[in-house]
Interface confidence: low
């Protein structure tokens, strides 16, 4: 147990002074039960050269109607109470002008949490006691000084429990109200052990951190049309109720045994999650029972491994994913993670790496849908009462961890002759054991195709002759013509495509005249604009579920419930010949290109979406001037 270990520290951060936008004037006194924290609040943050406007709404679904807290009183007796006055300061929302953005923050003492813009995940926390207007640090997860964390669930524990299907996903937006038959609810009970309590110092600090964590987990699961509702919190402020071992599998077993004994007198819940301050052995930060949701074994253990609560929230989301039948992404052939950020990992990746993930992969969604087909999953269909809502590296676990060159599972299951399953070192004479550029224990020669071109905005990737993994996915240079538009970060955004995405196959872009005005709040009036980069205007198709619309003649715009914000035309959409929407205006394609990048690629490559040379098969980056074989020979590193 290491209750006094220092939190991870930030390596790089930017100091910002958040500015709260004035809310609507209230002319009458608010009833005291509404609390100090408004239903909605907006902040402007100047960070990374941008002014981000965060629109937040209190997460009213955070606490279940019968939410209880259990702790040990001064006299040693166990107390369970239903706290009165369920006001809280935990918010969710989006960033203005960024269609796929998300935010999850607490405003209790300054701003703390995350906001996501495109593929950038920004973390924010106060630097001093100055409250919401004081100095705050904004940084990215990779700038937290922390070690990578892995999940202890291995392939052999998954067994035949997994039978993937397809999943329904939605992009949550303010004002979404989804049909209850679609939404699933996880009623969550969180247990906090004594080591975590000692680390945080008080019941209030524990409560605050747990609510932050669950708020983040809920935000991550909303993309799968799930809500995670906290129905109970148990704080072991005096002593642990069972032995919390550094071995996560032992701790999980103890948790589930304890839970089975407590179930009759504890809150009825769908899932229990332990948050511990104990340092699990090795790189493991979480462990879960697979496909156990809604059963007596529905639970997981999570080490609070990072200064920022987003860290343990990602671990909890991952372990809960196992409870919901999900496997690790690496174990599923052809699994696609749509993440485009540097580390490129989704929530069910076996290890966290240096960046916190923020989405589920295609195969996680398929596993989830498969789990939801089971009669067992019925406990997730009942909505809480919404009216009152206020280990050292282990050889044989299939994860290549510190000190291992490969890991093909336990010796009895290993079918990989390139890997010595007892030592997790490469077999004699083997250069590699895993990876798309590894074939029969040898690294494939430079120039072999390892990732074909998916569409006209993609680029194919080739093995480099040195590494068993395929190079990072890259895309055509932004601005390359594609069907009806211009490539932008691997997509081909057009008005027609956007309208189809929202309104279904029958959706089309509205008449050009519809784009010649911006709608003002409330769908009441409009003002002229000279380009097609304002509000997304469509016609035809089916009105998207849970979205309000503003109709003017044949022009249909999607808006929030209260009519204050409209779905914008996304960045990169074609708005005319050789023109694209960029920063809300129709601009010349040259905005994508700082220089004639392709000229630097020596006719042996093309420029990619990052303005870097993407070399033809067999040629070496960065400028495709030399053959890979020459470069390898010169460096003496040819395998």
């Amino acid at each position: 147990i290491a209750p006094s270990r220092p939190w991870a520290l930030m390596e790089q951060y930017e100091v910002v002074l958040p500015w709260r936008l004035p809310g609507p004037r209230v002319r009458r006194a608010l009833p005291s039960h509404l609390g100090l924290h408004p239903e909605r609040v907006s902040y402007v943050l100047g960070a990374t050269g941008h002014n981000f406007t965060l629109h937040l709404r209190k997460n009213r679904d955070l606490l279940g109607s019968g939410y209880t807290e259990t702790y040990t009183a001064a006299n040693g007796s166990e107390v369970t109470e239903q706290p009165r006055g369920q006001d809280h300061c935990f918010y969710q929302g989006h960033v203005e002008g960024y269609p796929d953005s998300a935010a999850s923050l607490s405003t209790c003492a300054g701003l703390r949490g995350f906001f996501q813009v495109g593929s950038d995940l920004h973390l924010i926390e106060p630097l001093d006691e100055g409250g919401e207007g004081g100095r705050h640090a904004v940084y990215q997860a990779e700038h937290l000084l922390q070690t990578a964390g892995t999940c202890g669930v291995s392939d052999d524990s998954l067994g035949s429990l997994l039978g993937p299907r397809t999943a329904a996903v939605f992009r949550p937006r303010p004002g979404d109200s989804l049909p209850s038959r679609e939404t699933r609810y996880v009623e969550l009970y969180v247990v906090v052990d004594n080591a975590e309590f000692q680390m945080l110092g008080s019941e209030a600090a524990v409560r605050h951190r747990v609510l932050e964590v669950v708020n983040h987990v809920d935000k991550l699961y909303q993309k799968l049309n799930f809500r995670v509702v906290l129905v109970g919190l148990e704080i072991w402020n005096s002593q642990d109720r069972f032995h919390v071992s550094p071995d996560p599998s032992v701790t999980l077993e103890n948790l589930l045994t304890w839970q089975a004994r407590q179930r009759t007198r504890r809150h009825l819940h769908d899932n229990v999650q332990l948050i511990t301050g104990v340092d699990f052995t090795g790189t493991t930060v979480g462990f879960a029972r697979v496909s156990a949701m809604c059963s007596h074994s529905s639970g997981a253990v999570n080490q609070d491994h990072s200064k920022n609560p987003v860290g343990v929230a990602c671990t909890m989301a991952h372990e809960m994913g196992h409870n919901l039948g999900m496997d690790h992404d690496e174990n599923v052939q052809g699994c696609r993670c749509q993440e485009r950020f540097e580390a490129g990992r989704c929530i069910m990746a076996g290890s966290i790496g240096s960046s916190f993930p923020r989405m589920f992969s295609d195969c996680s969604q398929a596993y989830l849908e498969s789990f939801l087909e089971r009669p067992q999953s019925v406990c997730l269909a009942n909505a809480p009462d919404l009216s009152h809502l206020v280990g050292g590296p282990v050889c044989g676990n299939l994860f290549v961890e510190r000190g291992e060159q490969c890991d093909c599972g336990p010796p009895e299951d290993c079918r990989n002759r390139c890997c010595n399953s007892t030592t997790c070192q490469l077999a004699e004479g083997a250069q590699c054991a895993h990876g798309t550029c590894c074939q029969e224990c040898k690294v494939k020669p430079a120039g072999e195709l390892c990732r074909p071109k998916k569409d006209m905005c993609d680029l194919e990737e080739f093995c480099d002759g040195r590494h068993p993994e395929c190079p990072e996915d890259a895309f055509q240079e932004n601005g390359t013509p594609c069907s009806g538009g211009y490539c932008y970060n691997g997509a081909c955004p057009t008005l027609a495509q956007q309208c189809q995405a929202f309104w279904g196959p029958g959706g089309q872009a509205a008449e050009e005249s519809c784009f010649s005005y911006d709608i003002l709040p409330g769908c009441k009036a409009s003002r002229y604009r000279a380009d097609m980069c304002g509000v997304l205007q469509c016609k035809g198709g089916q009105q998207p579920l849970g979205r309000a619309i503003c109709i003017v003649d044949v022009c249909h715009a999607l808006t929030t419930e209260d009519g204050t914000a409209y779905e914008p035309v996304p960045e990169g959409t074609r708005c005319g010949p050789e023109k694209v929407c960029w920063k809300g205006r129709c601009q010349d394609l040259h905005v994508y290109r700082s220089s004639n990048c392709s000229a630097q690629c020596h006719n042996h490559g093309v420029c990619n979406h990052k303005q870097e040379c993407h070399c033809h098969a067999g040629w070496a980056p960065p400028h495709c001037a030399k053959l890979l074989t020459e470069v390898h020979a010169a460096s003496g590193s040819l395998p």
């Epitope: 993937p164 299907r165 397809t166 999943a167 329904a168 996903v169 939605f170 992009r171 937006r173 979404d176 989804l178 049909p179 679609e182 049309n225 599923v332 052809g334 699994c335 696609r336 295609d362 195969c363 398929a366 849908e369 189809q500 995405a501 929202f502 279904g504 196959p505 089916q542 998207p544 579920l545 849970g546 979205r547």
Partner: nanobody
Framework: EVQLVESGGGLVQPGGSLRLACAAS????????MGWYRQAPGNEREWVAS??????AYADSVKGRFIISRDNAENTIYLQMHSLKPEDTAVYYC?????????????WGQGTQVTVSS
Amino acid sequence: EVQLVESGGGLVQPGGSLRLACAASKSIDNIHAMGWYRQAPGNEREWVASITSSATAYADSVKGRFIISRDNAENTIYLQMHSLKPEDTAVYYCKGQVLVPGGRNDYWGQGTQVTVSS
């Protein structure tokens, strides 16, 4: 609105094969996922197999015997069934899922009868 029409059902002996088809009235490029389900008399409808643009998945009871595939040009998905057993007897339904920002729309076909008997 997407209409789905199943065909290819019939009577077959144990150990035999059948190929079911499900034709969609619209391009299946826009359908996120398509799948086969079956319902035997007196039983609940159960999932058999699914396919998306990037993955296929099967129920344990049919794994290794059934193959799901799709032909985007024909707007059709198929279920190739081998080594059929009497317990595979059921009405087989095709389902399509179209994702919309608020969730999904599910579309079902009318079903085709498969009977495995000697």
